[in-house]
Interface confidence: low
Amino acid sequence: QEEDLPRPSISAEPGTVIPLGSHVTFVCRGPVGVQTFRLERDSRSTYNDTEDVSQASPSESEARFRIDSVREGNAGLYRCIYYKPPKWSEQSDYLELLVKESSGGPDSPDTEPGSSAGPTQRPSDNSHNEHAPASQGLKAEHLY
């Protein structure tokens, strides 16, 4: 008998409010044994698959999808789904990504032409993070 697959979860590091031009990493989590994680966009048949899956804990696996330079078009709803042979899971809850066009803080005026808000905090590895694997996963640039 096939096991019931738990729903995946989705989160974003460092957050869901991202300055224009900064980076964001979507983190999809599921049970151990996941072969493929898929990050899906809302209202479009667009997605990104990765088999770069790491074990985040004894009972959890994880994949990371990074966007190096967030644009206005990246704003929207995202969700995860995974493939654990022989079947696909349900989708995760939606996560909404907000893109802020500002140069000094969420409430500051729009960025001047030619300038770009800086990238968000970017831990380049996770050796001090017990919840995350060493792998940073694949860039999600072709998702869009």
Epitope: G15, V17, V27, G104, G118, P123, N129
Partner: antibody
């Protein structure tokens, strides 16, 4: 208006656990990474650790691992000093991540560890 | 281990002058560097992030530059109100890091 404020600082004896709380106003903690920093009297800024939005991933300074624990609720970010020593006497700040830096800082809360 | 070295530790500059503070990273941090101003009894104030992007409300007399391992904060047309301690901060690696802040530079305005 957006702000953060630390609380919980007080005089404690060595070894007595202490939890500091960072409370956010005007924005959602679920959307931002937050940092804890301390500053001993007359000294520079010392990073303790930070906690990320979403999954709540935590990162600690190498010297702080095991000595401090950062956690969050929907409205607060907490810093637990597990077993304070006199060297932990300092003003403790929390701040919100923005860009490669931290744009919104609390006024700080003073922790004094003395027997 | 990634650390930041700030120079000088202290500098005295006349009103109207220019001060340059340097921050050197022990390994490349791309442009993930920020600068802060701190006055006694106050929390740090973000001046510059992403090496050269000015934070909201910061006077144009403050400018940041650099990438990789070498970064500079320049304050021109110095005013008395600029007397403070300035810190750099890296926003790149969190692995085996003792501190993400530089040691600070005290700016004395005479």
């Amino acid at each position: 208006e957006q702000s953060v404020e630390e609380s919980g600082g007080r005089l404690v004896t060595p070894g007595t656990p202490l939890t500091l709380t960072c409370t956010a106003s005007g924005f959602s903690l679920s959307s931002y990474a937050m940092i804890w920093v301390r500053q001993a009297p007359g000294e520079g800024l010392e990073w303790i650790g930070d906690i990320y939005a979403g999954g709540g991933a935590t990162y600690y300074a190498s010297w702080a691992k095991g000595r401090f624990t950062i956690s969050k609720t929907s409205t607060t970010v907490d810093l637990k000093i597990t077993s304070p020593t006199t060297e932990d006497t300092a003003t403790y700040f929390c701040a919100r991540a923005y860009g490669s830096g931290y744009d919104l800082w609390g006024p700080g809360t003073l922790v004094t560890v003395s027997s | 281990e990634l650390d930041l070295t700030q120079t000088p530790a202290s500098v005295e500059v006349a009103v109207g002058g220019t001060v340059t503070i340097k921050c050197q990273a022990s390994q490349s941090i791309s442009s993930y560097l920020s600068w802060y101003q701190q006055k006694p009894g106050q929390p740090p104030k973000l001046l510059i992030y992403y090496a050269s992007t000015m934070a909201s409300g910061v006077p144009s007399r403050f400018s940041g530059s650099g990438s990789g391992t070498q970064f500079t904060l320049t304050i021109s047309d110095l005013e008395c109100a600029d007397a403070a301690t300035y810190y750099c901060q890296q926003g790149d690696s969190r692995s085996n890091v003792d501190n993400i802040f530089g040691g600070g530079t005290e700016v004395v305005v005479k």
